[in-house]
């Protein structure tokens, strides 16, 4: 377990943050896209 | 995301006493959380690691006096197996393997007769 | 266990001064650069500020600077400001999975 504790770094969450908020906006805007479509 | 501290209590010597760290936002699975802790009017004093696989590593003053568990995805706790007077302190989780980068906002321990 | 010597442990400044905190390590931190620094006022939490020796936190001013590597580092904040007056702390991350804090630095602003 040398490297145990450092695999949860702040870069590491951080590029985590980044993808979620562009899943969000992505989905976001395909779920608008479908109700103006509807 | 965020982390939060309870069980701080005014506890008399030698009685053993657990602290929880509950998280949301996040799962243990893929975290590491600390237990630090600040004496009043002193500086911060790390206690101890829970990694993301439930591996356990403590400053070596700390060793034989805390116990550090992960009970759900969820919550991580902290045992004072034996408390003294010393310990009183305002103990505080947080998130992050040596860079803490999400903080509870502690909770207080008073240890007296 | 490491052992981290920060340094002045109080040191008092004007606002848009600059004060300059510093990080010995007993040993070298992970990766050579496993250090971050925290911003704590009285009844809170300590604030994160610094990664990795050298990297700005989300939404920490760019007057905050965090440079060393290995064993020695330093803090450096510049353009003070009336909020910056708090107590300021340096922690390391080590092979062998321990951390550990300096004493901190107490910093006023005049």
């Known amino acids: 377990h040398s490297d145990g504790i450092f695999t949860d770094s702040y870069s590491r969450y951080r590029k985590q943050m980044a993808v979620k908020k562009y899943l969000a906006a992505v989905l976001g805007k395909r779920y608008k896209q479908r109700v103006k479509n509807k | 995301q965020s982390v939060e501290e309870s069980g701080g209590r005014l506890v008399t010597p030698g009685t053993p006493l657990t602290l929880t760290c509950t998280v949301s936002?996040?799962?243990?699975?893929?975290?590491?959380m600390s237990w630090v802790r600040q004496a009043p009017g002193k500086g911060l004093e790390w206690i101890g690691i829970i990694d993301d696989s439930g591996n356990t590593y403590y400053a070596s003053w700390a060793k034989a006096r805390f116990t550090i568990s992960k009970t759900s995805s969820t919550t991580v706790d902290l045992k004072m197996t034996s408390p003294t007077t010393e310990d009183t302190a305002t103990y505080f989780c947080?998130?992050?393997?040596?860079?803490?980068?999400?903080w509870g906002p502690g909770t207080l321990v008073t240890v007296s007769s | 266990d490491p052992v981290l010597t920060q340094t002045p442990s109080s040191v008092s400044a004007a606002v848009g001064g600059t004060v300059t905190i510093n990080c010995q390590s007993s040993?070298?931190?992970?990766?050579?650069?496993?250090l971050s620094w925290y911003q704590q006022k009285p009844g809170q939490s300590p604030k994160f500020l610094i990664y990795q020796a050298s990297n700005l936190a989300s939404g920490v001013p760019s007057r905050f600077k965090g440079s060393g590597s290995g064993t020695q580092f330093t803090l450096t904040i510049s353009d003070l400001e009336c909020d910056d007056g708090a107590t300021y702390y340096c922690?390391?991350?080590?092979?062998?999975?321990?951390?550990?804090f300096g004493g901190g630095t107490e910093v006023v602003v005049k």
């Open positions: 936002g996040f799962s243990l699975s893929s975290a590491a």
């Open positions: 922690a390391g991350g080590y092979r062998g999975n321990v951390c550990g």
């Open positions: 947080a998130r992050g393997g040596g860079e803490f980068f999400i």
């Open positions: 040993q070298s931190v992970y990766n050579n650069k496993w």
